[in-house]
């Protein structure tokens, strides 16, 4: 049985337009977090605000779902730890990277063993 | 660069299924969705469906949803759509392509498929 | 299923022309439409995604406009290699459906 996807939305803003077509959410910054959605209906456009949750392995439906690595060390410097994600799927107009990078602050007890390190000169 | 050999030609008689094959080389067949395409002689294109290698998500034409199957070998990256019952009506080229949004996509050379006793 | 309309079926024109390609959808698509060529006994090549976006290698005399019920495919300055059937393809609901297709023929 064919899957109905990628459909268009109706009513929505300006809802006297009877069915407006809505593209991707399109963060304003990096690969997720606030954008914009553009929508159109007939020779009305509309952009509205919306969110590409940076959760992307466990968000359920998102537009593109990733693979990940595992978490790298942690950087002392920037108190961070770094994963990569290679595309695993995207929804068929989904425009998504193929990898990604994910950053996220090292607990306190890896940072403190990060700054350890650092002080006794190890890379 | 995505690479995607079909076969040149088949053969087959009426009434027997057949399995056409794309084989994907080059980037990761696995994470973008493959598309069948057909196109009679002298005619334009018709989408038949297509399938998610990762998951093997299809999503079928309706009118083609007694006609064809599509399956993939994640192992050997290749695609496979299986045509039951063939007849004459059925003879045409059939395209394979790759797309992913971002970067657009690949399609293979096409298959002649020719249904005839 | 939408159903796309293009037009003219043919198009008669001299290299150096400007080639204007329209296909229009039953209902609105957003922005969800693909232009591609098609030459004799080959696949089809994608020229433009999304009504407007470029596609690497592509040349850049090729260029598309939308979004909406009404797109354009131009060609700012026909060359002799650009004599084919050029399709449109919508993505914004299943089925994925083609137009019947511009053929553009040397005047």
């Known amino acids: 049985v064919a899957k109905k996807k990628d459909k268009v939305k109706k009513g929505g803003p300006g809802s006297e337009c009877a069915e407006w077509a809505w593209g991707p959410c399109t963060p304003s910054s990096k690969d997720c977090g606030v954008g914009f959605r553009e929508g159109t209906c007939g020779a009305q456009t509309q952009r509205i605000r919306c969110r590409v949750p940076c959760n992307w392995k466990k968000e359920f439906g998102a537009d593109c779902k990733y693979k990940f690595e595992n978490w790298g060390a942690c950087d002392g410097g920037t108190g961070t730890k770094v994963r990569q994600g290679t595309l695993k799927k995207a929804r068929y107009n989904a425009q998504c990277q193929e990898t990604i990078r994910v950053t996220k602050p090292c607990t306190p007890k890896t940072k403190a063993k990060a700054k350890a390190k650092k002080g006794k000169g190890k890379d | 660069q995505v690479q995607l050999q079909q076969p040149g030609a088949e053969l087959v008689r009426p009434g027997h299924s057949v399995k056409l094959s794309c084989k994907a080389s080059?980037?990761?067949?696995?994470?973008?969705?493959m598309n069948w395409v057909r196109q009679r002689p002298g005619q334009g294109l018709e989408w038949i469906g297509m399938?998610?290698?990762?998951?093997?998500?299809?999503i079928l034409n309706q009118k083609f949803k007694d006609k064809a199957t599509l399956t993939v070998d994640i192992s050997s990256n290749t695609a496979y759509m299986q045509l039951s019952s063939p007849t004459s009506e059925d003879s045409a080229v059939y395209f394979c392509?790759?797309?992913?949004?971002?970067?657009?996509?690949?399609w293979g050379q096409g298959t002649t498929l020719t249904v005839s006793s | 299923e939408i159903v796309l309309t293009q037009s003219p079926a043919t198009l008669s024109l001299s290299p150096g022309e400007r080639a204007t390609l329209s296909c229009r959808a039953s209902?609105?698509?957003?922005?969800?439409l693909h232009w591609y060529q098609q030459k004799p006994g080959q696949a089809p090549r994608l020229l433009i995604k999304?009504?407007?976006q470029s596609i690497s290698g592509i040349p850049a005399r090729f260029s598309g406009s939308g979004p909406g019920t009404d797109f354009t495919l131009t060609i700012s300055s026909v060359e002799p290699e650009d004599f084919a059937v050029y399709y449109c393809?919508?993505?914004?609901?299943?089925?994925?459906?083609f137009g019947g297709g511009t053929k553009l023929e040397i005047k």
């Open positions: 999304y009504a407007s």
């Open positions: 399938i998610h290698p990762s998951d093997s998500e299809t």
């Open positions: 393809q919508q993505s914004n609901s299943w089925p994925l459906t």
């Open positions: 392509s790759s797309w992913s949004a971002k970067r657009g996509d690949f």
């Open positions: 209902e609105s698509i957003s922005n969800n």
């Open positions: 080059g980037q990761s067949f696995s994470s973008y969705w």
